[in-house]
């Protein structure tokens, strides 16, 4: 028969022959022959391969360097890489999470729209009319102005996006 020019899925062509690829978690040691199947061996400790492959070396698991603010979120296996995340109060600088930076704080006049996670920074939003934030914080949302009316008081000083309203007693009507 004619030697193949293409192989099925999970196979590769070598010496005019289709050989099985190695399954995830294993590396290629020797190609198949007419007598034997492909020789594959398991990745070692702290190594992985996550696809059907013909790699002769497994990849090293990612190292979550504590000096860069990283910690292990999910331990790697022979088929998956280690997933790093950042220590509390920090977040990844990229999708690959190779280093961490401190969560940003929302300045006065801005509130937290979304609290930061290990992989995303704080999202701030300007305080709309009727709301304020007078602190720099990574957690505080914009607070609504105090309702003077509900306290039977009147507004003595208007609120801003950075300050609350100041309430005061109503002026007594003179006889």
């Amino acid at each position: 028969p004619e030697p193949p020019t293409a192989c099925r899925e999970k196979q590769y062509l070598i010496n005019s022959q289709c050989c099985s690829l190695c399954q995830p978690g294993q590396k290629l040691v020797s190609d198949c022959t007419e007598f034997t199947e492909t020789e594959c061996l398991p990745c070692g400790e702290s190594e992985f391969l996550d696809t059907w492959n013909r790699e002769t070396h497994c990849h090293q698991h990612k190292y979550c360097d504590p000096n860069l603010g990283l910690r292990v979120q999910q331990k790697g296996t022979s088929e998956t890489d280690t997933i790093c995340t950042c220590e509390e109060g920090w977040h990844c600088t990229s999708e690959a999470c190779e280093s961490c930076v401190l969560h940003r704080s929302c300045s006065p006049g801005f509130g937290v729209k979304q609290i930061a996670t290990g992989v995303s920074d704080t999202i701030c939003e300007p305080c709309p009319v009727g709301f304020f934030s007078n602190v720099s914080s990574a957690f505080e949302k914009c607070h609504p102005w105090t309702s003077c009316e509900t306290k039977d008081l009147v507004v003595q000083q208007a609120g801003t996006n950075k300050t609350d309203v100041v309430c005061g007693p109503q002026d007594r009507l003179r006889a």
Partner: antibody, heavy 112, light 109 residues
């Protein structure tokens, strides 16, 4: 196929290099192991060189042997300081955890 | 390194008989085990790999099984040509090295 060469009679303390020549497959995607067999004794696994050139040795063989790729078709086994205990037929074979192609072997005799 | 212990060291059976050889690993090696046949003056010949897969061209009279630390090779309907020494070979994935059992001499009467 694989074939060994370089075996001879040497005196104790002499270094010796054996060569394994392969044909019909590529060293870039195939591991080569070295195995020896003393006269009338069993098989003894020495070490392996993988497709990427990394080497692994049995504990007893560390420091006594080195394995290296010397060309696209040859792998050398270097033996540092031979003793009479190293008298054996030395085989090279394709593979790491199993060996489907073996050479005929080359005899190394260490004697004073 | 893993240590492979093979038993018996020698066995004698008549033509048509059955021989069973055992191989024990000092630690779990999953199914990474091979069996070889060697005749005097020849290199070993691979019979079985991955504990139970028959190499192409090897008679189906050779059967092997096992996983972890205990492995078995059975030769049935013995023929004179089966007279040889048989070796198991394990692989220690923690350090990446192989190891052979001590061998079993099969005599066919």
């Amino acid at each position: 196929s694989v074939e060994e060469s370089g075996g001879r009679l040497v005196t104790p303390g002499t270094p010796l290099t054996l060569t394994c020549t392969v044909s019909g497959f590529s060293l870039s995607s195939n591991a080569i192991s070295w195995v020896r067999q003393a006269p009338g004794k069993g098989l003894e696994w020495i070490g392996v060189i993988d497709a990427g050139g990394s080497t692994y040795f049995a504990s007893w063989a560390k420091g006594l042997f080195t394995i290296s790729k010397t060309s696209s078709t040859t792998v050398d086994l270097q033996m540092t300081s031979l003793t009479t205990e190293d008298t054996a037929t030395y085989f090279c074979a394709r593979g790491w955890s199993r060996h489907d192609f073996w050479g005929p072997g080359t005899l190394v005799t260490v004697s004073s | 390194d893993v240590v492979m212990t093979q038993t018996p060291a020698s066995v004698s059976e008549p033509v048509g008989g059955t021989v069973t050889i055992k191989c024990q690993a000092s630690q779990s090696i999953s199914n990474i085990l091979a069996w070889y046949q060697q005749k005097p003056g020849q290199p070993p010949r691979l019979l079985i790999y991955s504990a139970s897969t028959l190499a192409s061209g090897v008679s189906s009279r050779f059967k092997a099984s096992g996983s972890g630390t205990e492995f078995t090779l059975t030769i049935s309907d013995l023929e004179c040509a089966d007279a040889a020494t048989y070796y198991c070979q394990g692989y220690d994935s923690t350090v990446g090295v192989g190891a052979f059992g001590g061998g079993t001499e099969v005599v066919v009467k």
